[in-house]
């Protein structure tokens, strides 16, 4: 798998998208996780509603979100709040069984805030030592919610 | 109607090639996962692998691996189990299964099933 | 791999009986199960999937039960057409691992 990156304002929301085959995944949970190493297990850090049918519904664990569009075939994370330590290596994953298929490796950046006059130093990017070979870079444009805005719609 | 149906049966000598099939109809073929199942005469089922005739994506049984290659054309709604040398004890019923993903659990099982391939090497 | 056993490996009953036969995995694997009835010169036909739900058109006198590494199948009252072997299945992980097969025969 190519990896993709995307790129996002600290503080702000990054939103990811991870697009699949809705026929080859159809009835298939879906898991977003968090790359430990190179080689090593990827964390789950939030899986879609356990009942596939429900996978439309937004789940949040923390300050991650995710909700799938079954019939589209589209994965949605999103990340509120970026922060510099969620900069890393992660995994759109389809689970069938207790395995799971990676439907896209991604790499999150995070951007210091311009209007953010703070030390920049702790903001992560991959170092010269690290490749990531025909990384695809995707810009997510996002931006804070606003004050009294409810991050997700409220049930009727 | 759902209907997977396979190729007749072969008698082969050892080390002779061999490509068996399996035609699916009534169904969106393409849409679907098939694997291949290997029963031995008188003994139990055997999972060998898995494709998806959409992309052609491949799963195989370590136990299977570089045995045989398991490949699909969906333009004809068929997916193929073939070898490039037959030994004896390949001689077995070979049977293509539909997988299919059931949502409630979101794991998939093998709800069609092929009439079987019957294999018989011998020299 | 997963192993999965099955017991007994044969069993007689006769018509109108309730006969049980058990799935143990080696390890868990939730309740990712399914339960085939093979005929003699047939292909395998699914009876149950996900531990306890009857695929379209089975009877109601077949239901699965358990979860984690033990599994039952029961038919609450044999009919004539059931004497078969039966083979459980484990969906859990690749490769898809299949119990030894019990087999039913007339008492």
């Known amino acids: 798998h190519n990896t993709t990156v995307f790129q996002g304002v600290a503080g702000q929301s990054l939103q990811v998208s991870c697009p699949y085959d809705s026929m080859k995944h159809w009835g298939r949970r879906k898991a977003w996780c968090r790359q430990l190493g190179e080689k090593g297990p990827c964390q789950r850090v939030v899986s879609t509603h356990n009942l596939w049918l429900l996978s439309f519904l937004r789940r949040w664990n923390g300050s991650t979100a995710i909700t799938d569009d079954t019939l589209g075939g589209t994965l949605t994370i999103t990340l509120r709040n970026l922060q510099p330590h969620d900069a890393g290596l992660y995994q759109c994953q389809s689970l069938h069984g207790s395995e799971a298929d990676t439907l896209r490796k991604v790499l999150v950046e995070v951007l210091a805030d311009p209007l953010d006059h703070r030390d920049a130093g702790d903001l992560w990017f991959p170092g010269e030592s690290e490749s990531f070979e025909d990384a695809h870079v995707e810009h997510s444009i996002s931006r804070s919610l606003l004050e009294g805005e409810i991050p997700f719609p409220p049930t009727s | 109607e759902v209907q997977l149906v396979q190729s007749g049966a072969e008698v082969k000598k050892p080390g002779e090639s061999l490509k068996i099939s399996c035609k699916g109809s009534g169904y969106s073929f393409g849409s679907y996962w098939i694997a291949w199942v290997r029963q031995m005469p008188g003994k139990g089922l055997e999972w060998m692998g898995i494709?998806?005739?959409?992309?052609?994506?491949?799963r195989y049984s370590p136990s299977f691996q570089g045995q045989v290659t398991i490949s699909a054309d969906k333009s004809i709604s068929t997916a193929y189990l073939q070898w490039s040398s037959l030994k004896a004890s390949d001689t077995a019923m070979y049977f293509c299964?539909?997988?299919?993903?059931?949502?409630?659990?979101?794991?998939?099982?093998?709800?069609?099933w092929g009439q079987g391939t019957l294999v018989t090497v011998s020299s | 791999d997963i192993q999965m056993t099955q017991s007994p490996s044969s069993v007689s009953a006769s018509v109108g009986d309730r006969v049980t036969i058990t799935c143990r995995a080696s390890q868990g694997i939730s309740s990712w199960l399914a339960w085939y009835q093979q005929k003699p010169g047939k292909a395998p036909k699914l009876l149950i999937y996900?531990?306890?739900s009857r695929q379209n058109g089975v009877p109601s006198r077949f239901s699965g039960s358990g979860s984690g590494t033990d599994f039952t199948l029961t038919i609450s009252s044999l009919q004539p057409e059931d004497f078969a072997t039966y083979f459980c299945?484990?969906?859990?992980?690749?490769?898809?691992?299949f119990g030894q097969g019990t087999k039913l025969e007339i008492k």
């Open positions: 494709i998806y005739p959409g992309d052609s994506d491949t």
């Open positions: 299945q484990q969906a859990d992980s690749s490769p898809r691992t």
């Open positions: 299964a539909r997988s299919r993903t059931f949502y409630y659990d979101s794991s998939d099982y093998f709800d069609y």
């Open positions: 996900a531990a306890s």
